[in-house]
Structures are given as structure tokens and as C-alpha cells.
């Protein structure tokens, strides 16, 4: 993982200062308030993950 300023995170990932590493934007579906989600190009269109069908 690269620190901010040294190299960007790879496509589909965003830097989390909270976790000190690049994180997958896909996880923003379940945890939309994560700090790195602000850096993801676009929020996934699906709503927050259902707990039960």
C-alpha cells in the first residue's frame, strides 16, 4: 500500500487515513460512511446492504 502523495491507490480503491491503507470502493455499499468512500469516483447505485431478504 502506498501512502497518500507517494502514489495513488489502484483503480477501484481509495486511500483511508483511518485505516492507513488503500481500501476497495466496493465496500462502501456496506459502510458508506467510511472516510475513503469520499475518494471513490462514484457511490455504487445499490442501497445499503439488506440485512435479510
Amino acid at each position: 500500500e502506498q501512502a497518500p502523495g507517494t502514489a495513488p491507490c489502484s483503480r477501484g480503491r481509495s486511500w483511508s487515513a483511518d485505516l492507513d491503507k488503500c481500501m476497495d470502493c466496493a465496500s462502501c455499499r456496506a459502510r458508506p460512511h467510511s472516510d475513503f468512500c469520499l475518494g471513490c469516483a462514484a457511490a455504487p447505485p445499490a442501497p445499503f446492504r439488506l440485512l435479510w431478504p
Epitope: 485505516l19 466496493a26 455499499r29 456496506a30 455504487p44 447505485p45 446492504r49 439488506l50 440485512l51 435479510w52
Partner: antibody
Framework: EVKLGESGGGLVQPGGSMKLSCVAS????????MNWVRQSPEKGLEWVAE??????????HYAESAKGRFTISRDDSRSSVYLQMNNLRAEDTAIYYC??????????WGQGTSVTVSS | DIVLTQSPASLAVSLGQRATISCKAS??????????MQWYQQRPGQSPKLLIK???KLDSGVPARFSGSGSGTDFTLNIHPVEEEDTATYYC?????????FGGGTRLEIK
């Protein structure tokens, strides 16, 4: 280096109780949801329970097979997660693993602790 | 609950050849952007280990011999070229909703 150490397994009679523990290190425990997953030859890998964060009021979720009998809890000060299992049945016999997840992936697994329910 | 059906249940592949494992979900586990499917490897006598997340993203440290593909309900794990150390059981797992469920596993033997 991430380490997960499960303990508390053993032999218990049907109807009995058991409390499993898992001590974690090497990752920011307070920021990860924690899961218990079990594995048996009969049912394969089976998710059992999940506990979320303090900011989520430690929300818990259970598989149908665990509801009403199992209770998951965590102690962030000890980087530990627990599984209290009551009214145990033969079909609860399995290896029990704890695993952290940030959102979707069970990133790390411990070595597991074996639970045998038999008379 | 979402049911994950893996096939084949077991397969034997010659060293250096390709192993292909399928996982079919009883309903879609994909958005237009991401697929919520993971693959795990469990070597004999060991705990499961995350290999692939979100259908196609290799976890850190996983060799490029492993690849994942698919979306919707149909997913595939490919290993090429297979090596001796790939002898293991492979499981798919979805994170679309609770409860999380796993496939029944595919046992890979290297000939």
C-alpha cells in the same frame, strides 16, 4: 502480522453451554466487524454470527440456526470477541473460526477451536 | 437465503495445466459496478484463506496464477498454471446480504 487465537472448545453434552473466545492482534480491531464461522463435514462452511462496531451500538446478526441460542459479544479493550453457545445440539459440532471483516471479505482466519456436542 | 452451488465437487488437474471452478448463485449478487463474491482456499489441515474479493480482485500476496471472473449469478475461479501447492479445497462466498453463505467447496488435486 495478523493473529487470531480461538479457544474454549471441547466436549459438551447436548443441552449444555460453552463460551468461545478469540483474541486478535495486528489490525485495528475497533474498526472491523467480527464474525464467527463454523465448519463441519456435514454442512461445510457456515456463517454463524457477526458483531459490528461501537458506533453501530455493537449491532449483532445471527444465522437462523444460532438465533435464540448463541450470543456474540466483543471487548474492544481486549481486542477480543466471544461466542456464548447455549442449548447445544449435536449439529453444532464443528470447528469454530473467528474472522474480521471490514465490509464484505473475511480477511483473516484463526486456526479454529473444535466443539463436539455428544453424550 | 442465497444458495451458492459449486461445480465440480472435485477435479484433478495435471501440473502446469488450468483448473476452472464454477460458482452459481440462486440470485444476482452484483450491482452495475461491483460483484459481491469472494473465493477462499483451504489447504489440507489449514484454515481458509482469502484469495479473491469482489469477483476478480486478488487479495494481497495472492499469485497472479489465480484469477476470478463473472457477474450476476455466474462466477468462475481459474488457476493457471496449477502448482503442487494449489492442492486444496476452494470455496465461494457472497456478501450481498445477510446471511452470508458459502458454496459447498471444490477439492482440487494436482496430478
Amino acid at each position: 502480522e495478523v493473529k487470531l487465537g480461538e479457544s474454549g472448545g471441547g466436549l459438551v453434552q447436548p443441552g449444555g453451554s460453552m463460551k468461545l473466545s478469540c483474541v486478535a492482534s495486528g489490525f485495528p480491531f475497533t474498526k472491523y466487524w467480527m464474525n464467527w464461522v463454523r465448519q463441519s463435514p456435514e454442512k461445510g462452511l457456515e456463517w454463524v454470527a457477526e458483531i459490528r462496531l461501537k458506533s453501530d451500538n455493537y449491532a449483532t446478526h445471527y444465522a437462523e440456526s444460532a438465533k435464540g441460542r448463541f450470543t456474540i459479544s466483543r471487548d474492544d479493550s481486549r481486542s477480543s470477541v466471544y461466542l456464548q453457545m447455549n442449548n447445544l445440539r449435536a449439529e453444532d459440532t464443528a470447528i469454530y473460526y473467528c474472522s474480521p471483516t471490514y465490509a464484505d471479505t473475511m480477511d483473516y482466519w484463526g486456526q479454529g477451536t473444535s466443539v463436539t456436542v455428544s453424550s | 437465503d442465497i444458495v451458492l452451488t459449486q461445480s465440480p465437487a472435485s477435479l484433478a488437474v495435471s501440473l502446469g495445466q488450468r483448473a476452472t471452478i464454477s460458482c452459481k448463485a440462486s440470485q444476482s449478487v452484483s450491482t452495475s459496478t461491483y460483484s459481491y463474491m469472494q473465493w477462499y482456499q483451504q489447504r489440507p489441515g489449514q484454515s481458509p484463506k482469502l484469495l479473491i474479493k469482489y469477483a476478480s480482485k486478488l487479495d494481497s500476496g495472492v499469485p497472479a496464477r489465480f484469477s476470478g471472473s463473472g457477474s450476476g449469478t455466474d462466477f468462475t475461479l481459474n488457476i493457471h498454471p496449477v502448482e503442487e501447492e494449489d492442492t486444496a479445497t476452494y470455496y465461494c462466498q457472497h456478501s450481498w446480504e445477510l446471511p452470508y453463505t458459502f458454496g459447498g467447496g471444490t477439492r482440487l488435486e494436482i496430478k
